[in-house]
């Protein structure tokens, strides 16, 4: 079948890194500079992605694979394939349309990206605040007040898993 297909369509013989050139009687020509074909039988080579501006090249383009970009220092990738670069902020801040802003009281951000998230409400789990929260750090919940009363068992049940929204990203 492969042989039959090849006789019918000479382009099917062109390997990755080449294209079937109609200007040269459908012979397999190498991809032009800064272009690639990742599969065989292609009639054109795709132009390589150019990492420019806040993007920088993470992986160079080859004749068989596209370039990959990441972000220059002070920025981080957003979206699949690093489609955009977003400005970093300091811990304890979030990025708004007006730039980096400190987290409001009662919220924190322990990363250079993302939004400020509310401190954990320890009382919802029947616990007390062991360490106060800051703009950069969540509160630390300690044993419930009942656990600290005299004669109480020192063995406490494991704390429930935190909500997904509070897990480090």
């Amino acid at each position: 079948f492969e042989r039959t297909r090849s006789l019918q369509d000479p382009c099917s013989n062109c390997p990755a890194g080449t294209f079937c050139d109609n200007n040269r009687n459908q012979i397999c020509s190498p991809c032009p500079p800064n272009s690639f074909s990742s599969a065989g039988g292609q009639r054109t080579c795709d132009i390589c992605r150019q990492c420019k501006g806040v993007f920088r090249t993470r992986k160079e383009c080859s004749s068989t694979s596209n370039a990959e970009c990441d972000c220059t220092p002070g920025f981080h990738c957003l979206g699949a394939g690093c489609s955009m670069c977003e400005q970093d902020c300091k811990q304890g801040q979030e990025l708004t349309k007006k730039g980096c802003k400190d987290c409001c009281f009662g919220t924190f951000n322990d990363q250079k990206r993302g939004i400020c998230r509310p401190w954990t409400n320890c009382s919802l789990d029947g616990k007390s605040v062991l360490v106060n929260g800051t703009k950069e750090r969540d509160v630390v919940c300690g044993p419930s007040p009942a656990d600290l009363s005299p004669g109480a068992s020192s063995v406490t049940p494991p704390a429930p898993a935190r909500e997904p929204g509070h897990s480090p990203q």
């Epitope: 500079p33 800064n34 054109t44 795709d46 132009i47 390589c48 992605r49 150019q50 990492c51 420019k52 501006g53 090249t57 957003l78 979206g79 699949a80 394939g81 489609s83 955009m84």
Partner: antibody, heavy 118, light 112 residues
Framework: QVQLQESGPGLVKPSETLSLTCTVS????????WSWIRQPPGKGLEWMGY???????QYNPSLKSRVTISVDTSKNQFSLKLSSVTAADTAVYYC????????????WGQGTLVTVSS | EIVMTQSPLSLPVTPGEPASISCRSS???????????LDWYLQKPGQSPQLLIY???NRASGVPDRFSGSGSGTDFTLKISRVEAEDVGVYYC?????????FGQGTKLEIK
């Protein structure tokens, strides 16, 4: 090989919203950037904006307040909405595959003429 | 935004003769990676534009070798070594360095 096909109404009333869809065939939309470019009758080309398959967008500042581009990877389509249109928005609208996010439009649709008139 | 200016706007050519189109940008298109982010497109009558040249001088696959691009910084040239009847249409340069990408006004090539 990759083919792009624009679809949508050819006539839109002033102050209404122009809506077009581009269907990509012969390849997956789940890579590259996808742009809309327009050309008023007898005039030059104007880039309107792009979308990446993950949903990231960038728009021409001259149109930013009026243009929205969205993507539906399950249908291999991306769409353009242009609000508050006037006669000046009468143009042939092209969708194109954008190799780098604002550069080298290697594959184009055949274009669709949208007339803004009451 | 970067402004692109083409000349001439009209170019009558005899088949078999060479042709040259100039494109100038309001700021340098030479990026730190050593590439000039300039494309050339041809829009044949009643058709969509098609990419001819990218990164200033790279011919897109399938484009005849009579087309060549040259230049750097702010001054660029598209040359056709021997014009054929099928080359008629409007040629556009486009800067791809900054968003928004911007096009020249176009050069209409016609056969004498």
């Amino acid at each position: 090989q990759v083919q792009l096909q624009e679809s949508g109404p050819g006539l839109v009333k002033p102050s209404e919203t122009l809506s077009l869809t581009c269907t990509v065939s012969g390849g997956s939309i789940s890579s590259y950037y996808w742009s809309w470019i327009r050309q008023p009758p007898g005039k030059g080309l104007e880039w309107m904006g792009y979308i990446y398959y993950s949903g990231s967008t960038q728009y021409n500042p001259s149109l930013k307040s009026r243009v929205t581009i969205s993507v539906d990877t399950s249908k291999n389509q991306f769409s353009l909405k242009l609000s508050s249109v006037t006669a000046a928005d009468t143009a042939v609208y092209y969708c194109a595959r954008d190799q780098s996010g604002g550069g080298s439009f290697q594959h184009w649709g055949q274009g669709t003429l949208v007339t803004v008139s009451s | 935004e970067i402004v692109m200016t083409q000349s001439p706007l009209s170019l009558p050519v005899t088949p078999g003769e060479p042709a040259s189109i100039s494109c100038r940008s309001s700021q340098s298109l030479l990026y730190s990676n050593g590439y000039n982010h300039l494309d050339w497109y041809l829009q044949k009558p009643g058709q969509s534009p098609q990419l001819l040249i990218y990164l200033g001088s790279n011919r897109a696959s399938g484009v005849p070798d009579r087309f060549s691009g040259s230049g750097s910084g702010t001054d660029f040239t598209l040359k056709i070594s021997r014009v054929e009847a099928e080359d008629v249409g409007v040629y556009y340069c486009m800067q791809a360095l900054q968003t928004p990408p911007t096009f020249g006004q176009g050069t209409k090539l016609e056969i004498k």
